[in-house]
């Protein structure tokens, strides 16, 4: 007796791992026999090479190699994601339609979310390793190696939670190098080494004791720069502090600093940076042109110490120590027109009040300069002669203009009608090209 | 279409807890990370938890940490954030986003707003 | 934790001028794979924040080509060649190299 097609067995979700082919079930009943024809994101699929897809007999599909990402549907955005496969089995009285199995390739992405830090723990004492692993499909798994070996995991003493590796009772045979292993089928990614560090236990109450330290941040002076760090160094300054209470000193010394905000304005976040120094030491990396708030912490293992006092300093500006980018000359009517990008903001070395146009000699444009004030990026200059018109631009700060970006030029022919400033797709004129093409 | 809805926003006690949900759909749930960001009235952005695809790795602020818990269930395409302990300075809308690796979060809900207070 | 700054903080712009948004971070972004994971997200008015560009300079699908973000480091802009009146909102940047994220303050761009 004949009867519509039925889906007795559906494809099921499945990882693609190669090397060999993937296999797609599907199994259906009905009367006469129905036929199988399978579907992609609910695109028919060709069978035809070099489609990578294969029927056999029995409506199984063969994936011979993953199929390309070409027609991912609407809101997958992982190159895990292969796509959704149905089979649909039709005869004369009807067709029926599979449930969706999706096919995935394995993938292990290589930035760790967060990587296990050398560290420093005591004797007898608990200590946690971070690791944060790898974004994986499958999710990955983590271990840990400790000196190039897989470490023996003890109950009771080692857990490992959430990627991270909890040391119950510090021994003085955990000393070494501990790494982080993250773990797929689509391969494992190795974490930086960590170096641990096993101290025997000291007299005193570490917390106690450093809440007693007082720090004074005596001052902070801006350091010369160092002609080793070539011509435009971030500027660096010098901090001093004098440390009284107890006998047991701070292990260590950290920085914060942030820029200061306008009277009355929420203050900006603190950053923090380790000090190399226990009385004095140089903090790098600010920028010029800007107030800045200092203060001093003491810290010991994790315990911290009250902050220090704090101290502002204003470092002076600079001149922008880099051109304004993309500088373009353009025709309008009797008039040029020059526009610039602002130098970019690492180089501002400032705050930015305008810019120097100059005009340069030898060209339609006496010698001339003009000053734009503000955050404009454009000039208009009146011409009244075809020629040649080539121009600088540079940004100007508290201390001056900085340096002048390459000579951009435009040559406006008799007519008017044609200007070019960008020959054979090479970018703008430069002085040197504008006068070749002169003598030619 | 991608679709992200939050929903457990409310009014509540300072020291007292609340849990957040936020429903999925229109993607493969179980592949993507997820996070929760929440704004202060008038105030910026503020991230406050991420859990891994297979929910084993999460990772919070320490304004959060300890107070906070990030869950999921893959089987019903939903995430959750239990907040206990709660203080005045987490009043804010809370809002779920789907995370690309761990690279960016490229779809974000409505949001839903928690106001602690007494 | 790593700061984030953006400046300005408040930006009047001219409809169909150019814009210009500077985001810094306290250390370098760049890991030890030489991935740079910052992204710029714009929050129109009474609305969830929007992707606009990731991993730098990437621009996310359905985004105006009219956007564009550059920088590396600690120093990174967000530029929109032309302004529209649909752009006005706070944009914020995003750090996710290293845990915690931490976003920058937002600057606020209207039409002036």
């Known amino acids: 007796q004949d009867s519509p097609p039925q889906i007795l067995v559906h494809p099921q979700d499945q990882l693609f791992q190669g090397p060999g082919p993937a296999r797609m079930s599907c199994q259906a009943s009905g009367q006469p026999p129905p036929t199988i024809r399978w579907l992609l994101n609910g695109q028919p699929l060709s069978m035809v090479p070099p489609d990578p897809h294969h029927l056999l007999p029995d409506g199984t599909l063969l994936l011979l190699q993953p199929p390309a990402r070409g027609h991912a549907h609407d809101g997958q955005a992982l190159s895990t994601d292969l796509g959704v496969y149905t089979c649909e089995a039709s005869n004369r009285l009807g067709t029926a339609v599979s449930r969706g199995a999706r096919l995935s390739v394995a993938v292990l992405r290589e930035d760790f979310q967060i990587q296990p830090r050398d560290m420093v723990a005591v004797v007898g004492e608990q200590f946690t390793l971070e690791c944060g692993p790898p974004w994986g499909h499958p999710e990955p798994t983590v271990s840990w190696w400790k000196d190039g070996k897989p470490l023996a995991l003890q109950p009771g003493r080692h857990t490992v939670s959430g990627g991270s590796l909890l040391m119950a009772r510090a021994e003085k045979s955990d000393e070494g190098t501990y790494m982080c292993v993250a773990t797929n089928s689509a391969g494992h990614r190795e974490s930086r080494a960590a170096r641990v560090s096993i101290q025997e236990p000291q007299d005193y109450t570490e917390p106690v004791e450093l809440l007693a330290v007082r720090i004074q941040l005596e001052n902070v002076t801006l350091l010369n720069p160092d002609p080793a760090e070539g011509p435009k160094p971030r500027p660096a300054v010098w901090l001093s502090w004098k440390v009284s209470g107890p006998a047991a000193p701070a292990q260590s010394y950290t920085a914060l600093f942030r820029t200061q905000t306008a009277p009355g304005g929420q203050g900006a976040p603190w950053a923090e940076e380790l000090l190399a120094g226990w009385q004095s030491a140089e903090l790098g990396g600010l920028h010029w042109g800007q107030d800045y708030e200092f203060k001093v912490r003491p810290s010991s293992g994790r315990a911290r110490g009250p902050d220090s006092n704090v101290l502002l300093l204003r470092l002076p500006e600079k001149v922008p120590s880099a051109p304004p980018q993309e500088v373009t000359l353009k025709p309008g009517n009797g008039t040029v027109f020059v526009s610039w990008v602002p130098p970019p903001a690492e180089n501002h070395n400032g705050i930015i009040r305008g810019y120097q146009v100059w005009s340069l000699g030898n060209t339609s444009l006496p010698p001339a300069n003009w000053t734009v004030v503000g955050e404009q990026t454009q000039l208009e200059i009146a011409t009244h002669m075809p020629g040649s018109y080539c121009v600088q631009v540079a940004a100007v700060t508290g201390a001056g203009a900085g340096e002048p970006s390459r000579p951009v030029c435009l040559l406006l022919e008799q007519a008017m009608e044609r200007a070019t400033q960008e020959p054979s797709e090479h970018g703008p004129w430069t002085l040197e090209q504008l006068r070749a093409t002169l003598k030619r | 279409e991608v679709q992200l809805v939050e929903s457990g926003g409310g009014l509540v006690q300072p020291g007292g807890s609340l849990r957040l949900s936020c429903a999925a759909s229109?993607?493969?749930?179980?592949?993507?990370?997820m996070s929760w960001v929440r704004q202060a009235p008038g105030k910026g952005l503020e991230w406050v938890a991420t859990?891994?695809?297979?929910?084993?790795?999460?990772y919070y602020p320490d304004s959060v940490k300890g107070r906070f818990t990030i869950s999921r269930d893959n089987a019903k395409n939903t995430l959750y954030l239990q907040m206990n302990s709660l203080r005045a300075e987490d009043t804010a809308v809370y809002y779920c986003?789907?995370?690309?690796?761990?690279?960016?979060?490229?779809?974000w809900g409505q949001g839903t707003l928690v106001t602690v207070s007494s | 934790d790593i700061v984030m700054t953006q400046s300005p903080l408040s930006l009047p712009v001219t409809l169909g001028e150019p814009a210009s948004i500077s985001c810094r971070s306290s250390?370098?972004?760049?890991?030890?794979?030489?991935?740079?994971?910052l992204n710029w997200y714009l929050q129109k008015p009474g609305q969830s924040p929007q992707l606009l560009i990731y991993?730098?300079?990437n621009r996310f699908s359905g985004v105006p080509d009219r956007f564009s973000g550059s920088g590396s480091g600690t120093d990174f802009t967000l530029k929109i060649s032309r302004v529209e009146a649909e752009d006005v909102g706070v944009y914020y940047c995003?750090?996710?190299?290293?845990?915690?994220?931490?976003f920058g303050p937002g600057t606020k761009v209207d039409i002036k």
């Open positions: 859990i891994s695809n297979g929910g084993t790795y999460t």
């Open positions: 991993r730098v300079s």
């Open positions: 995003l750090q996710v190299t290293h845990v915690p994220w931490t």
């Open positions: 986003a789907r995370l690309i690796y761990y690279d960016y979060l490229d779809y």
């Open positions: 250390q370098s972004l760049e890991n030890s794979n030489g991935n740079t994971y």
């Open positions: 229109g993607f493969t749930f179980s592949t993507y990370a």
